[in-house]
Interface confidence: low
Amino acid sequence: SEGRKTWRRRGQQPPPPPRTEAAPAAGQPVESFPLDFTAVEGNMDSFMAQVKSLAQSLYPCSAQQLNEDLRLHLLLNTSVTCNDGSPAGYYLKESRGSRRWLLFLEGGWYCFNRENCDSRYDTMRRLMSSRDWPRTRTGTGILSSQPEENPYWWNANMVFIPYCSSDVWSGASSKSEKNEYAFMGALIIQEVVRELLGRGLSGAKVLLLAGSSAGGTGVLLNVDRVAEQLEKLGYPAIQVRGLADSGWFLDNKQYRRSDCIDTINCAPTDAIRRGIRYWSGMVPERCQRQFKEGEEWNCFFGYKVYPTLRCPVFVVQWLFDEAQLTVDNVHLTGQPVQEGQWLYIQNLGRELRGTLKDVQASFAPACLSHEIIIRSYWTDVQVKGTSLPRALHCWDRSFHDSHKASKTPMKGCPFHLVDSCPWPHCNPSCPTIRDQFTGQEMNVAQFLMHMGFDVQTVAQQQGMEPSKLLGMLSNGN
């Protein structure tokens, strides 16, 4: 997790994941697991889910648990490196029965000059070097192979690509006498894809390039390039799609202007402007053509790059993203938030909602949080009654139903889901907020009061009686 976290969330939410949904027929969730042999054709993963479920129920006491771990493979091409020159790599868990491949790009901020990269190397070395990486990693959230934790793609081939280039996955410069650090994020992705072709990716039907935070932005920057790479290497049939989590940032005005001294106080535009030069950063070709030389930094911002992308991308973004608020200098620690800050936060939600208007596939809950797809509680959050795995499933189905992603989702199977309520945590399924100092869970009322929430003002804004608003909030809604 990245940066200064103002609020801590529990690892697991109180509500359980919604029931596991096998691929529903005609838009209806399947409520049990009867074996359905008629559905096998063209839907092998769904059939496998049924078989796995049956097998698990027949062997409740089996000690032969499937190994959930993803195993580390350092790149054979050692010239593609992390910041410090150590080889980059990836963690892989193969699923031989599946033709789906999920490649996940890790997040973790960035550094954009010698000073803050040195500081990062001292404090967060695993984000700049592969030297101390563990041999295995456990897949969580969308990388889990357990249907209960990952009703969406539990049976896929899982690849976790650690972030060790500090360049928002955009760099293409190697370590040299001139450069103390290598920035090869974009090249790492290309090399991982090349190596995976020899490990079964060549037979893939769908490659989903996913990522969180800086990895989410990395998806937007690299998804078209991966599709182009596979086409050039002779695999045009592999459908490449993107899933960008918590990487859709706004180049908005900071709440309080600050000098660009360190990573988290630097305004988004300043940081990326400096970074792109320092990293020799690459942006998608079609986006680059839209901006003049020196203005390529624009392509790091989702709402500007998205319209230029050829590959379908599903955007997951908290309306009140902690990383966005951090770079905007809204620090929700200590003192209650002043009214100006409160209005700024509400306005951020409105602006973000506006940028997602024309994004076909999106999931944007009105929560104060950061990252979701590899959290184990990723199934718990809902927007308008639909969970994220369900929305992703509906998005998937839109490709089956027509060769081009259908503009209109099937009835009862939505995948454009943006909360419309106006303040942080007005959605009852948001991840739990904890007070940073006491560690105690706060309900929405406590959280808003802590933020200096003025009942009269907000009630007025919402056009309701203060007593009604308080009643709603006291009940945690």
Epitope: P14, D380, C430, E441, N443, Q446, G471, N475, G476, N477
Partner: antibody, heavy 119, light 111 residues
Framework: EVQLVESGGDLVKPGGSLKLSCAAS????????MHWLRQAPEKGLEWVAY????????SYANTMKGRFTISRDNAKKTLSLQMTSLRSEDTAIYYC????????????WGTGTTVTVSS | DIVLTQSPASLVVSLGQRATISCRAS??????????MHWYQQKPGQPPKLLIY???NLESGVPARFSGSGSGTDFTLNIHPVEEGDATTYYC?????????FGSGTKLEIK
């Protein structure tokens, strides 16, 4: 195992007082808002009172306001309900229940303790 | 207070068939796309047990035979196929505002 166990139920005369307790185990008690609910013999469920995780919000059903007091001790993982000026219509099984943060439903219930108000 | 009217008060369903229980609220219990309606099962001598939360979400460990639907003021609990052990009382509850209130209950019998 997540568990709530009520105690303190008894036979008491109208106008009398009684204090019910609820001991929590198996979860971080201080994280959760807690409720008391009750069920009169052969009747439905009725909400009694609510206390937020840090005791900052207290709320009571209208018919119990001024007579009942809800409190909690997070260090001891206990929830209490002090009942005064008891009436015959307060006769019921009293349950403590954990409020789920995400939406105000009761996801864990105690087994209940019986309060009988009769002369 | 929001009044919840549950119907029918009692219901007889054949083994393996569908049981449908309705709950109507005097005011909408939905807001911003969320419906604050929940369903419980209570067996004699036991506390209520949560089945469905936020109108349609199945509580962990509850069989998929139970499902919930509805929004605004009208909500439904469905049990299909019903089993012997389902013969007991079911309650709806809202948490839209304080105080939370319950329906008067539906007693399900299996024939």
């Amino acid at each position: 195992e997540v568990q709530l166990v009520e105690s303190g139920g008894d036979l008491v005369k109208p106008g009398g007082s009684l204090k019910l307790s609820c001991a929590a185990s198996g979860f971080t008690f201080s994280d959760y808002g807690m409720h008391w609910l009750r069920q009169a013999p052969e009747k439905g469920l009725e909400w009694v009172a609510y206390i937020s995780s840090g005791s900052t919000t207290l709320s009571y059903a209208n018919t119990m306001k001024g007579r009942f007091t809800i409190s909690r001790d997070n260090a001891k993982k206990t929830l209490s309900l002090q009942m005064t000026s008891l009436r015959s219509e307060d006769t019921a099984i009293y349950y403590c229940a954990r409020k789920n943060y995400n939406g105000g439903y009761f996801d864990v219930w105690g087994t209940g303790t019986t309060v009988t108000v009769s002369s | 207070d929001i009044v919840l009217t549950q119907s029918p008060a009692s219901l007889v369903v054949s083994l393996g068939q569908r049981a449908t229980i309705s709950c109507r609220a005097s005011k909408s219990v939905s807001e911003s796309g969320y419906s604050y309606m929940h369903w419980y099962q209570q067996k004699p001598g036991q506390p209520p047990k949560l089945l469905i939360y936020l109108a349609s979400n199945l509580e962990s460990g509850v069989p998929a035979r139970f499902s919930g639907s509805g929004s605004g003021t009208d909500f439904t609990l469905n049990i299909h196929p019903v089993e012997e052990g389902d013969a007991t009382t079911y309650y709806c509850q809202h948490s839209r505002v304080l105080p939370p209130t319950f329906g008067s209950g539906t007693k399900l019998e299996i024939k």
